[in-house]
Interface confidence: low
């Protein structure tokens, strides 16, 4: 089981590091988006796992970026963000669509509503229960 967890972490690490770099190969990204969406988590240990991914970087600004699947919809009151950015992208996750051609990325403003927990703990619980 420990080896499985290590292998899973390695796969997730590669997925995070290469997120959005190849628009033609998005299966792993979509799978990880779905994990974050369903488990209500973001990143491996922490949401900050995403902050150093080059494809997600802002143009020199302090605002970091994360996949939109990191957004906690129930805590977001900004209807503009919800209607125009997040919901259209998350609706695809909800239907497990496989038609996406580019990474769905959202900015993280100073006071953001992204999931605060990493996914590692939830995934490890799932592994232990199966």
């Amino acid at each position: 089981r420990a080896q499985l967890e290590r292998s899973l972490r390695d796969v997730v690490e590669k997925t995070i590091q290469k997120y959005g770099t190849n628009p033609e190969e998005t299966a792993a990204e979509e799978s990880w988006d779905y994990v974050q969406f369903q488990l209500r988590c973001c990143g491996w240990h922490y949401p900050q796992d995403w902050f150093q991914v080059l494809i997600l970087r802002g143009n020199g600004s302090e605002a970091h970026r994360v996949p939109c699947s990191c957004y906690n919809l129930s805590a977001t009151n900004d209807s503009t963000i919800l209607d125009k950015v997040i919901l259209p992208q998350l609706s695809r996750l909800g239907h497990l669509a496989r038609s996406r051609h580019s990474a769905d990325i959202c900015a993280v403003p100073a006071e953001s509503h992204i999931y605060r927990e990493g996914c590692a703990q939830g995934l490890q619980k799932w592994l232990h229960n199966n």
Epitope: D49, H64, S112
Partner: antibody, heavy 116, light 110 residues
């Protein structure tokens, strides 16, 4: 940006509180760490306060050093100061990456001198 | 607490040369290691994270490697601007929070 303040000359045993003021990012999203450097010496990790307010300290710092924070500032309270605590104290933003961390944004530091 | 041992304490190489700095951890820290560069009167600047990853904007002349307890920072094609003190930092926050800096290595560029 990150800016430390509060460093000054104090006598041994005097308590002192350093303040770290941040702008351009939210402390609710980031951990903040404290690192010190004695004159001509290396870097020494003191402790960190995470985004939720939980604190972690180096073994040697437990009991004498306390981290706390508000919405835009982080404080380091120091008690029972000795001459060995003379150093430049840095506040730094911590980024986390797969269970490891590093400090990507540092202040210029504030000098604390403990002398009788 | 984990103890980080850095060697050598000081190294001198000519412009265009290569410097190798080693860092040893007293216990297994996987890849949880960062490297920093510090110049006199300035705060540290981070160079490498997660043992071998280069942050955006840092020259590819800096290379980190290693895992477990043995780590290396290699600076190739030395430039005069590389003259500084370099520190390794263990930072393992996966279970219990452990952090510590190495003693530093002064790099002199001749």
């Amino acid at each position: 940006s990150v800016e430390e303040s509060g460093g000054r000359l104090v006598t041994p045993g005097t308590p002192l509180t350093l303040t770290c003021t941040v702008s351009g990012f939210s402390l609710s999203n980031y951990n903040m760490g404290w690192v010190r450097q004695a004159p001509g010496k290396g870097l020494e990790w003191i402790g960190v306060i995470d985004a939720s307010g939980t604190t972690y300290y180096a073994t040697w710092a437990k009991g004498r050093f306390t981290c706390s924070k508000t919405s835009s500032t982080v404080e380091l309270k120091m008690t029972s100061l000795t001459t060995e605590d003379t150093a430049t104290y840095f506040c730094a933003r911590e980024l986390l990456y797969f269970g490891s961390s590093y400090y990507d944004l540092w202040g210029q530091g504030t000098l604390v001198t403990v002398s009788s | 607490d984990v103890v980080m041992t850095q060697t050598p304490a000081s190294v001198s190489e000519p412009v265009g040369g290569t410097v190798t700095i080693k860092c040893q951890a007293s216990q297994n820290i996987d890849s949880n290691l960062a490297w920093y560069q510090q110049k006199p009167g300035q705060p540290p600047k981070f160079l490498i994270y997660y043992a071998s990853n280069l942050p955006f904007g840092v020259s590819s002349r800096f290379k980190g490697s290693g895992s477990g307890t043995q780590f290396t920072l290699t600076i190739s094609d030395l430039e005069s601007a590389d003259a500084a003190t370099y520190y390794c930092q263990c930072a393992d926050v996966g279970s219990t929070y452990v952090a510590a800096f190495g003693g530093g290595t002064e790099v002199v560029v001749k």
